[in-house]
């Protein structure tokens, strides 16, 4: 009689994560007597997957009834497959021995590959806010997919972006992979309502890409524009001066009125109005008692927006002149040091 052969007919088996893998194995003879064991990997570090004789293997079931005397089918099913199960599986016949069974013959091995979906992409933006016309970086990460081939695209408000760099790791063979991409986005004043989207397409997703989003409202800072105007006289000795704070984002804003450099009043923006583009407008007014001043008064509206250096706009109030409505024609004064805070 011919010597027993262990036949693993499948060189490779491909299974989707979460499914059951069937690993086929048959023996050509009932002799010698002895159990079958399944291992992942070869050599001394191999991992026992199933032992016909003893042990508890909750994820493994046999295709045939191994207790039947004439059984020569030693195929197994492994349930709830994950990428960690990938590897080469060997069906090994042992010969009954004393005290231990002796390895007799091994199958050629079956390589189990696992297809796994990428995780939902996570998009993160810069740690600090940036102002319009500046370029900011967004990163997108997705993990745990297999095979390695994957497509990543960036969009801003539905328009595809081209300035990005993507890496898939590791470079070599692995049971699963990760993708990391960095996109550069130029901010505009209209970006408060904008979204940046990272879209990942993979064969396992069957045409339904995964998307991660970031709202530019978390990233952008739109500095305010200031306008100081003198309103018509309320009484012969009173002048109403307003400071219009326009097109700012986020809402966090503190305004200080100064009369000839001395703090008159400080207030925090509360009842703001929202513009269509998501920015805010706010107005503060100051009632100046002209009769209390002998000389001309320099009124300054100083605004500290979102913790940035203050910007200010001044208005010269002529005490000698008969009070009438007049616009502000003085240049803005920037009490901060950063030119880009003035628009």
């Amino acid at each position: 009689e011919e010597e027993l052969q262990v036949i693993q007919p499948d060189k490779s088996v491909l299974v989707a994560a979460g499914e059951t893998a069937t690993l086929r194995c048959t023996a050509t003879s009932l002799i010698p007597v002895g159990p079958i064991q399944w291992f992942r990997g070869a050599g001394p570090g191999r991992e026992l997957i199933y032992n016909q004789k003893e042990g508890h293997f909750p994820r493994v079931t046999t295709v045939s009834d191994l207790t039947k005397r004439n059984n020569m089918d030693f195929s197994i099913r492994i349930g709830n497959i994950t990428p960690a199960d990938a590897g080469t599986y060997y069906c090994v016949k042992f010969r009954k021995g004393s005290p231990d069974d002796v390895e007799f013959k091994s199958g050629a091995g079956t390589e189990l590959s696992v297809r796994a979906k990428p995780s939902a992409p996570v998009v993160s933006g810069p740690a600090a806010r940036a102002t319009p016309q500046h370029t900011v970086s967004f990163t997108c990460e997705s993990h745990g997919f297999s095979p390695r081939d994957i497509t990543l695209k960036w969009f801003k408000n539905g328009n595809e972006l081209s300035d990005f760099q993507t890496n898939v790791d590791p470079v070599g063979e692995s049971v699963s992979y990760s993708i990391h991409s960095t996109a550069k986005v130029v901010l505009t004043r209209e970006d408060v309502h904008s979204q940046v989207i990272c879209e990942v397409a993979h064969v396992t997703l069957q045409g339904d890409p995964l998307r991660g989003t970031a709202n530019l409202s978390e990233t952008i800072r739109v500095p305010p524009t200031l306008e100081v105007t003198q309103q018509p006289v309320r009484a012969e000795n009173q002048v109403n001066v307003t400071c219009q704070v326009r097109k700012f984002y986020p809402q966090r804003l503190q305004l200080t009125w100064l009369e000839n450099g001395n703090v008159s009043r400080t207030e925090t923006a509360s009842t703001v109005t929202e513009n269509k583009d998501g920015t805010y407008n706010w107005m503060s007014w100051l009632l100046v008692n002209v009769s209390a001043h002998r000389d001309d008064v320099k009124l300054t509206c100083q605004v500290e927006h979102d913790g940035q250096p203050a910007v200010s706009k001044s208005h010269d109030l002529k005490v000698s002149a008969h009070p009438k409505e007049q616009g502000s024609n003085t240049a803005a004064e920037n009490t901060g040091s950063n030119e880009r805070n003035i628009y």
Partner: antibody, heavy 119, light 110 residues
Framework: EVQLVESGGGLVQPGGSLRLSCAAS????????MIWVRQAPGKGLEWVGI???????YYATWAKGRFTISRDNSKNTLYLQMNSLRAEDTAVYYC?????????????WGQGTLVTVSS | DIQMTQSPSSLSASVGDRVTITCQAS??????LSWYQQKPGKAPKLLIY???NLASGVPSRFSGSGSGTDFTLTISSLQPEDFATYYC????????????FGGGTKVEIK
């Protein structure tokens, strides 16, 4: 048993329209990508279009504008609406289901339905 | 769009013969290649997917190999029920999704 059954084929005049159906049983259509493939008499296989599990459709360049794939999840049925039919659209039309591991292969096929475009 | 070139377009072989069919993609498709068997009047049947994986219920005499642009289907010992037409099919994505079939190889009895 997992099965696909096409229907709706027949004789149609050039310029006419036809709607093919593909009834699925043994699985939910909304969990797999589904493809339409056609085969002209004595010729090879040609993909027409595909629908993703969420209902997004993709078409072969030549099929865009004339052919529309849709799905009725409540009836577990896939459709192929064919308009402005030409003689060269004469073929057996197959629907097929993508594998669970991805939409690069198709492991369940219907028996096909013959569409003849002729005056 | 990607083109799949299958060869030969037909071949004659005897039962027990080893048969090899090749498929070439016009650009790299990684391992996204499937093989189907079709008998007259019947629907195609999946044999091999992802270049080398045997579909459920397919005899082990069928095997597939290759990656990139060149792929092979091998029938180690041709059986009477294997006389049929065989098609390769690719999946590819660049700017849009694309599935393409080869022209087919008819395996006839010698």
């Amino acid at each position: 048993e997992v099965q696909l059954v096409e229907s709706g084929g027949g004789l149609v005049q050039p310029g006419g329209s036809l709607r093919l159906s593909c009834a699925a049983s043994g699985f939910s259509l909304s969990t797999y990508a589904m493809i339409w493939v056609r085969q002209a008499p004595g010729k090879g296989l040609e993909w027409v279009g595909i629908i993703s599990p969420s209902g997004t459709t993709y078409y072969a360049t030549w099929a865009k504008g004339r052919f529309t794939i849709s799905r009725d999840n409540s009836k577990n049925t896939l459709y192929l609406q064919m308009n402005s039919l030409r003689a060269e659209d004469t073929a057996v039309y197959y629907c097929a289901r993508a594998g669970s591991g991805g939409w690069d292969y198709f492991n369940i096929w219907g028996q096909g339905t013959l569409v003849t475009v002729s005056s | 769009d990607i083109q799949m070139t299958q060869s030969p377009s037909s071949l004659s072989a005897s039962v027990g013969d080893r048969v090899t069919i090749t498929c070439q993609a016009s650009q790299s498709i990684s391992s996204y290649l499937s093989w189907y068997q079709q008998k007259p009047g019947k629907a195609p049947k999946l044999l091999i997917y992802y270049a080398s994986n045997l579909a459920s219920g397919v005899p082990s005499r069928f095997s597939g190999s290759g990656s990139g642009t060149d792929f092979t289907l091998t029938i180690s010992s041709l059986q009477p029920e294997d006389f049929a037409t065989y098609y390769c099919q690719s999946y590819y994505y660049s700017n849009n999704y694309n599935w393409a079939f080869g022209g087919g190889t008819k395996v006839e009895i010698k």
